[in-house]
């Protein structure tokens, strides 16, 4: 049903869904703090632009009685229940900042006539791609896939002279929400990644993964997995690893690798870590001081969602345009706005673009070093360390298939 929006006459409201089921186990209080910090910034920016308007947020909490798994498994109905609550209260803001779970976002998008923009900190799955009024402020699976295909095909770098066309993917079902959808996308037979690879097998058991590490008959030297170093160690332990194995560890939302005093443990020497370029000022900000390196990105996405709304509101008000129109709902894409930690770019489909960073462990210093960066906006790789101190032979990444000559 049509719900009137609190979105006119100089008063603009943001509906923030505070769902018990969330992509990251973050206390809702921290997300509230992030939203409130964002509101302060937006109010200041609008005032500086000479726009004398009111911007507020309404936090919509679910009762948590039915949907209490805490993760995303029971989020589908929770999102719809919250929308029903908004509908019954006849109280909808100009924008919905909310569901981080792929299940809930997909279902909410499907089951509602969205004439308002939806901003998500999460919704990583491919099923949330190409949604006309959905904006995602954390790297979705599609971006990861495009990097991997780009990197697999690269063969003209001093440290990577072979194109790759094969991979194992380790996916055991215990992953975090982001990892679950990243690996899901790699597993999907119809995905771009699967389409571009000649061979891909999903390893679902710990033993399968462990056996591959020294299996002379393995079909690929490359294994993709998702998580942090500790996750890898629990799986791999102190087992020997064949010298031409390359483990790609996807750990996008973790700034820790860039801290000065971090030392890479021995078991990381065969590993390339894919993460995001860290923010500049986040460590000292009031809302993020007590957050873990992963949760910083989640809270930041909420904060940036508020700043994005403020950016769009400012543009529409300055142009004398109506906010409660399909044009506004469809406008949250193909733009760059000033985020909390610098410019944030959204692609044509409203998904955040970022700089991904591939790290390796220096055998000399035991430090994580940047091997290359990848700009998701232009789908381009930029080598950084032209003579890396790799563990691999001749300081070059091996071929993906043992015994195969130059391609």
């Amino acid at each position: 049903s049509q719900v009137s929006q609190n979105c006119h006459n100089g008063s603009y409201e943001i509906s923030v869904l505070m769902m018990g089921n969330s992509a990251f186990a973050e206390p809702l209080k921290n997300l509230e703090d992030a939203v409130n910090e964002g509101l302060e910034i937006v109010r200041g920016r609008l005032q500086n632009a000479g726009l004398n308007v009111t911007v507020n947020a309404t936090f919509m909490y679910s009762d948590g009685l039915i949907h209490n798994s805490g993760d995303c498994r029971s989020s589908t109905c929770e999102g719809l229940d919250l929308l029903r609550k908004i509908s019954n209260a006849q109280r909808m803001g100009c924008v919905l900042i909310g569901p981080s779970c792929t299940y809930s976002t997909f279902q909410m998008y499907l089951d509602t006539e969205l004439s308002y923009p939806m901003i998500s900190a999460g919704s990583f799955g491919l099923s949330c791609d190409y949604k006309e009024t959905l904006t995602r402020l954390m790297s979705p699976a599609r971006k990861l896939m495009y990097f991997l295909v780009n990197f697999w095909k690269t063969n003209d770098l001093p440290f990577k002279t072979y194109s790759w066309s094969t991979s194992y993917v380790y996916k055991n079902g215990t992953e975090t929400e982001d990892c679950f959808w990243y690996l899901n996308a790699l597993e999907a037979s119809v995905s771009y990644f699967s389409h571009e690879l000649g061979f891909k097998v999903v390893l679902r058991q710990d033993k399968e993964f462990q056996d591959i590490l020294m299996d002379h008959n393995r079909k690929s030297n490359v294994i993709i997995m998702c998580g942090g170093p500790e996750f890898l160690y629990k799986l791999k332990g102190d087992r020997a690893v064949a010298e031409d194995i390359v483990i790609i560890l996807v750990d996008l939302f973790n700034d820790q690798y860039f801290e000065d005093n971090v030392t890479a443990p021995d078991y990381m020497k065969n590993v390339l870590v894919l993460t995001l370029s860290p923010g500049n000022s986040l460590l000292n900000s009031s809302f993020s001081r007590n957050l873990s390196p992963t949760k910083r990105d989640f809270a930041l996405a909420y904060l940036n969602g508020i700043l994005l709304f403020g950016h769009m509101l400012k543009i529409f008000l300055e142009n004398g345009e109506n906010i409660t129109t399909p044009k506004f709902a469809h406008a949250f894409r193909n733009l760059t706005f000033e985020g909390y930690d610098g410019p944030v770019t959204l692609d044509d489909w409203g998904d955040v673009d970022s700089t991904m960073v591939l790290l390796y462990t220096s055998v000399d210093t035991k430090k994580y070093k940047v091997l290359l960066t990848y700009d998701t906006h232009v789908n381009k790789t930029y080598p950084v360390d032209m003579s890396p101190t790799f563990t691999w032979k001749n300081s070059k990444l091996p071929n993906d298939i043992t015994g195969r000559g130059p391609q």
Epitope: G228, P229, E230, Y233, G237, D238, Q256, E259, N261, V262, T263, P265, D266, Y267
Partner: nanobody, 115 residues
């Protein structure tokens, strides 16, 4: 602030035994490996023994069969049982704890083997 405190160093006669202990205070996180290193005057610091949380132990050739390392991850402590001590074992012994992210060193405890 994490601190490692070693104890157990002493003056002992050749053939004697000592047990070194190292305890971490503060929030250290999940431990990957613990170890003992030593540095004799005018020499480089060298590995004595290490143990990982996965159960792998590693000893310097010169101490194999005489020294035993044991770690207690739950209590953030590591021990080094040293038997059949020799004069060449004289050194400052340092404990090292490595989490999955950080490396911590103790201040060292002096072991002197002399008659």
């Amino acid at each position: 602030q994490v601190q490692l405190v070693e104890s157990g160093g002493d003056l002992v006669q050749p053939g004697g035994s000592l047990r070194l202990s190292c305890a971490a205070s503060g929030s250290i996180g999940s431990i990957y490996a613990m170890g003992w290193y030593r540095q004799a005057p005018g020499r480089q610091r060298e590995l004595v023994a290490t143990t990982t949380s996965g159960g792998t132990t590693n000893y310097a050739d010169s101490v194999k069969g005489r020294f035993t390392i044991a770690g207690d991850n739950a209590k953030n402590t590591v021990f080094l049982q040293m038997n059949s001590l020799r004069p060449e074992d004289t050194a400052v012994y340092y404990c090292k704890i490595q989490t999955h992210w950080y490396v911590y060193w103790g201040q060292g405890t002096q072991v002197t083997v002399s008659s």
